[in-house]
C-alpha cells in the first residue's frame, strides 16, 4: 500500500491503493547537492545523472573506513524520495547530482558555493527548462552562502533546503535562513514536528512550510533493490522539491514568488501541534504541511 | 526561507575592520571610509580557520578578481606568508577562495573591491 508520506501529500481524489501521477515533473531538472549516490539503484536508474562535480573535505579520524554503501546512503535515499519509481514524489523528474558532502555527511560552505556556481554555469551553457536545486544540508548562518542562493534564485532557479535538525531557530542556519530559498521543516505521520534523538526539526519564521520527514521509505544504497526508512528535514525538503518539480512541469512559467504562493496555498493548514515549539516561536512558525494541488488540476498534474 | 524577513545574523559574529588608507601603496585605493567586514561561524566547532572566501563587490569582473587574488598573494609573500588561491568565483558571486593564515585578514580586508570576507565553515547532511 501507499507509504504514509506519499498519502499525506496526495489530494484525497488520488488516494487509491497506489500513488502514481504519471510522468510528474518531466519538464524539470532537479539538482541534488549531497553525498555520492548509487545512481544505478533500481528505484532511480536512468533518472539521475551523476555530474563530475565533487568538492568535499577529507573524512575525520585516522581509522575512518570508507564503505561505498555508507558514502552513498544519504544522497541515494533523497534521490529516491524526489523521483523514485515506486516511492518517489515526482516520478518523471530527472536529476543531476553534485557531491558536496563526504562519507560522513560533512561538507563546507566553500564547496557548496562552488557547487552552486557550477549549476549556474551549466544553466548558462545549456539552458533547459525549469531548475530546482535541493540543498539537504545545513551549517551555521553564512552571509556568503545566503548571498549565493539569492543570486541563483534571481537567475530563475528554485532552491529548496532543509530547515535543519537542531530543534532551533532556522534563522541561525544557512542556507535555511536565506529569504529566497524555500526552507522546509519536518513533520511525522501524526502531523507532529519531528523529534530526532534529543533534537528535532528547526522552526521559526525562516521556515516556509513543513513536509513529511519521519520514517520515510526510500532507496537504500545497501543493495540495488533495497529500501530503507530515514528521517530528517532533508527528507522533508526532498518532498517539497518533488512537489515543486511537478508544479513547474505543469506550469513552467511560474515565478519563484508564484510557486511559493502555490506551495502555501495547497498546503494543509493548522494541522501541526504547535505545543512542540518554544512558546515565543509558535506564532512565527508557519502551520503548513506541503501537499500536491487537488483534483481540479488533474489535467495539469496527472496527465 | 520565508520571504519578507529582514536579514538576521543571529549569533553570527561580524568583525568590522575599518580600512586604513596608508596601506602599502595600493594602486587602486578603496573609497575613503568604506569598510569591508569579516564574518565567521558562530558555532565554534563548525569553524574552518585557515580557509577564507573573499567576496568582492557586485560588479567586479573576473580579471579584477584574479588581479586582487594575485595582489593578496604578493603582499602576503612580502610579509613572509604563503597563500594558496583554491578557486576564483565568477558567475554567481565575484571573489576567491584562499588558504592563508588568519594573520593576513586585516591585510586582505584592505584590498580593492573587497566587500567582505567569510571564514569557511562546515555544513552537514540533515
Amino acid at each position: 500500500s501507499i507509504p504514509w508520506n506519499l498519502e499525506r501529500i496526495t489530494p484525497p481524489r488520488y488516494r487509491a491503493d497506489e500513488y502514481q501521477p504519471p510522468d510528474g515533473g518531466s519538464l524539470v531538472e532537479v539538482y541534488l547537492l549531497d553525498t555520492s549516490i548509487q545512481s544505478d539503484h533500481r528505484e532511480i536508474e536512468g533518472r539521475v545523472m551523476v555530474t563530475d562535480f565533487e568538492n568535499v573535505p577529507e573524512e575525520d579520524g585516522t581509522r575512518f573506513h570508507r564503505q561505498a554503501s555508507k558514502c552513498d546512503s544519504h544522497g541515494t535515499h533523497l534521490a529516491g524520495v524526489v523521483s523514485g519509481r515506486d516511492a518517489g514524489v515526482a516520478k518523471g523528474a530527472s536529476m543531476r547530482s553534485l557531491r558536496v558532502l563526504n562519507c560522513q555527511g560533512k561538507g563546507t560552505v566553500s564547496g557548496t558555493l562552488i557547487g552552486l556556481e557550477f549549476i549556474r554555469k551549466s544553466q548558462l551553457v545549456q539552458p533547459v527548462g525549469p531548475l530546482v536545486v535541493l540543498l539537504p544540508l545545513a551549517g551555521g548562518y553564512s552571509r556568503v552562502l545566503n548571498a549565493a542562493c539569492q543570486r541563483l534564485a534571481r537567475a530563475g532557479v528554485v532552491l529548496v533546503t532543509a530547515a535543519g535538525n537542531f530543534r532551533d531557530d532556522a534563522c541561525l542556519y544557512s542556507p535555511a535562513s536565506a529569504p529566497e530559498v524555500i526552507t522546509v521543516g519536518a513533520t511525522n505521520a501524526q502531523d507532529q514536528p519531528v523529534t530526532l534523538g534529543t533534537l528535532g526539526t528547526n522552526f521559526g519564521r525562516c521556515v516556509d512550510l513543513f513536509a513529511p520527514g519521519e520514517d520515510i521509505i526510500g532507496a537504500s544504497s545497501d543493495c540495488s533493490t533495497c529500501f530503507v526508512s530515514q528521517s530528517g528535514t532533508s527528507q522533508a525538503a526532498a518532498h517539497v522539491a518533488g512537489i515543486a518539480a511537478m508544479m513547474l512541469s505543469a506550469e513552467p512559467e511560474l515565478t519563484l514568488a508564484e510557486l511559493r504562493q502555490r506551495l502555501i496555498h495547497f498546503s494543509a493548514k493548522d494541522v501541526i501541534n504547535e505545543a512542540w515549539f518554544p512558546e515565543d516561536q509558535r506564532v512565527l512558525t508557519p502551520n503548513l504541511v506541503a501537499a500536491l494541488p487537488p483534483s481540479t488540476h488533474e489535467n495539469l498534474y496527472f496527465q | 526561507g520565508a520571504m519578507g524577513q529582514e536579514d538576521e545574523d543571529g549569533d553570527y559574529e561580524e568583525l568590522v575592520l575599518a580600512l586604513r588608507s596608508e596601506e602599502d601603496g595600493l594602486a587602486e585605493a578603496p573609497e575613503h571610509g568604506t569598510t569591508a567586514t569579516f564574518h565567521r561561524c558562530a558555532k565554534d566547532p563548525w569553524r574552518l580557520p585557515g580557509t577564507y572566501v573573499v567576496v568582492l563587490k557586485e560588479e567586479t569582473h573576473l580579471s579584477q578578481s584574479e588581479r586582487t587574488a594575485r595582489r593578496l598573494q604578493a603582499q602576503a609573500a612580502r610579509r613572509g606568508y604563503l597563500t594558496k588561491i583554491l578557486h576564483v568565483f565568477h558567475g554567481l558571486l565575484p571573489g576567491f577562495l584562499v588558504k592563508m593564515s588568519g594573520d593576513l585578514l586585516e591585510l586582505a580586508l584592505k584590498l580593492p573591491h573587497v566587500d567582505y570576507i567569510e571564514e569557511d565553515s562546515s555544513v552537514f547532511a540533515q
Epitope: 502514481q20 504519471p22 545512481s39 544505478d40 533500481r42 536508474e45 561505498a68 519509481r85 515506486d86 | -
Partner: antibody
C-alpha cells in the same frame, strides 16, 4: 546512440564454463547496471541477474546463484557473465540489457551445450 | 512455470484492438509501478514497448498502451497491423529480482 554489443556464438561441452561479454556505449554507464536474460529455444525469457556498473555489486536470480558470476571492466565499458558447470538445459540465447528497466538489449549470444 | 501468467495466444484482424493480460500477485505486479511489456519478432532481441505500467518509450507507436488494475496488467494494441504479429512478454519487479510472463503469441489474421 545507445548500444550493447555482445560476443559471438559458442558451442560448449557439458561441465565446461562459458564467458559472454557485453560492451556498452552511448550513455552514462554509471546511471544503469546491466541485466542478463536468457531464452531457451522456443521458450520464454528468464532473468538471470544484474550487475552495477557503478560499484560492481551483483544481484543474482536464486536459480543460478552459485553457478553464475558477473563482472565489469569499467576501463573498457564491458560487462561479463560467466556460467560454470554447463548443462544441456543451459542451451539458450543469452542477452544483456540495460538496467533493471531493460530498455536497450544486446543482439544476443547463442550458446549450445552439447556432448 | 513463469511467475506471471499470460494467455498463450491471442489473435485479431487488421484494424481491430486486442488486449493481452498479465496476472501476478501483490508481491510483483500489484506491489510495484514497474510493469514492462516487450515485443519480440523471431530471431530478434526483445524490444521495450511499455515501461512503468503505461509509459511509451520514444519511437513506439501510440497504438500501444498499458494499464494496471490490482494484480493484473494489460497491454492494448489498437488499429492492429500485420507487423504487430510477434511474441509479447510482460515483466515486473519483485522485492529482489525481476520476473517475466510466459509470453503471448499475437497472430494478425
Amino acid at each position: 546512440q545507445v548500444q550493447l554489443v555482445q560476443s559471438g556464438a559458442e558451442v560448449k561441452k557439458p561441465g565446461a564454463s562459458l564467458k559472454v561479454s557485453c560492451k556498452a556505449s552511448g550513455y552514462s554507464l554509471t546511471s544503469y547496471g546491466i541485466s542478463w536474460v536468457r531464452q531457451a529455444p522456443g521458450q520464454g525469457l528468464e532473468w538471470m541477474g544484474w550487475i552495477s556498473a557503478y560499484n560492481g555489486n551483483t544481484n543474482y536470480a536464486q536459480k543460478v546463484q552459485g553457478r553464475v558470476t558477473m563482472t565489469t571492466d569499467t576501463s573498457t565499458s564491458t560487462v561479463y557473465m560467466e556460467v560454470r558447470s554447463l548443462r544441456s538445459d543451459d542451451t539458450a540465447v543469452y542477452y544483456c540489457a540495460r538496467g533493471y528497466g531493460m530498455d536497450v538489449w544486446g543482439q544476443g549470444t547463442t550458446v549450445t551445450v552439447s556432448s | 512455470q513463469s511467475a506471471l501468467t499470460q494467455p498463450a495466444s491471442v489473435s485479431g484482424s487488421p484494424g481491430q484492438s486486442i488486449t493481452i493480460s498479465c496476472t501476478g500477485t501483490s508481491s510483483d505486479v500489484g506491489g510495484y509501478n514497474s510493469v514492462s511489456w516487450y515485443q519480440q519478432h523471431p530471431g530478434k532481441p526483445p524490444k521495450l514497448m511499455i515501461y512503468e505500467v503505461s509509459n511509451r518509450p520514444s519511437g513506439v507507436s501510440n497504438r500501444f498502451s498499458g494499464s494496471k488494475s490490482g494484480n493484473t496488467a494489460s497491454l492494448t494494441i489498437s488499429g492492429l497491423q500485420a507487423e504487430d504479429e510477434a511474441d509479447y512478454f510482460c515483466s515486473s519487479y519483485t522485492s529482489t529480482s525481476m520476473v517475466f510472463g510466459g509470453g503471448t503469441k499475437l497472430t494478425v489474421l
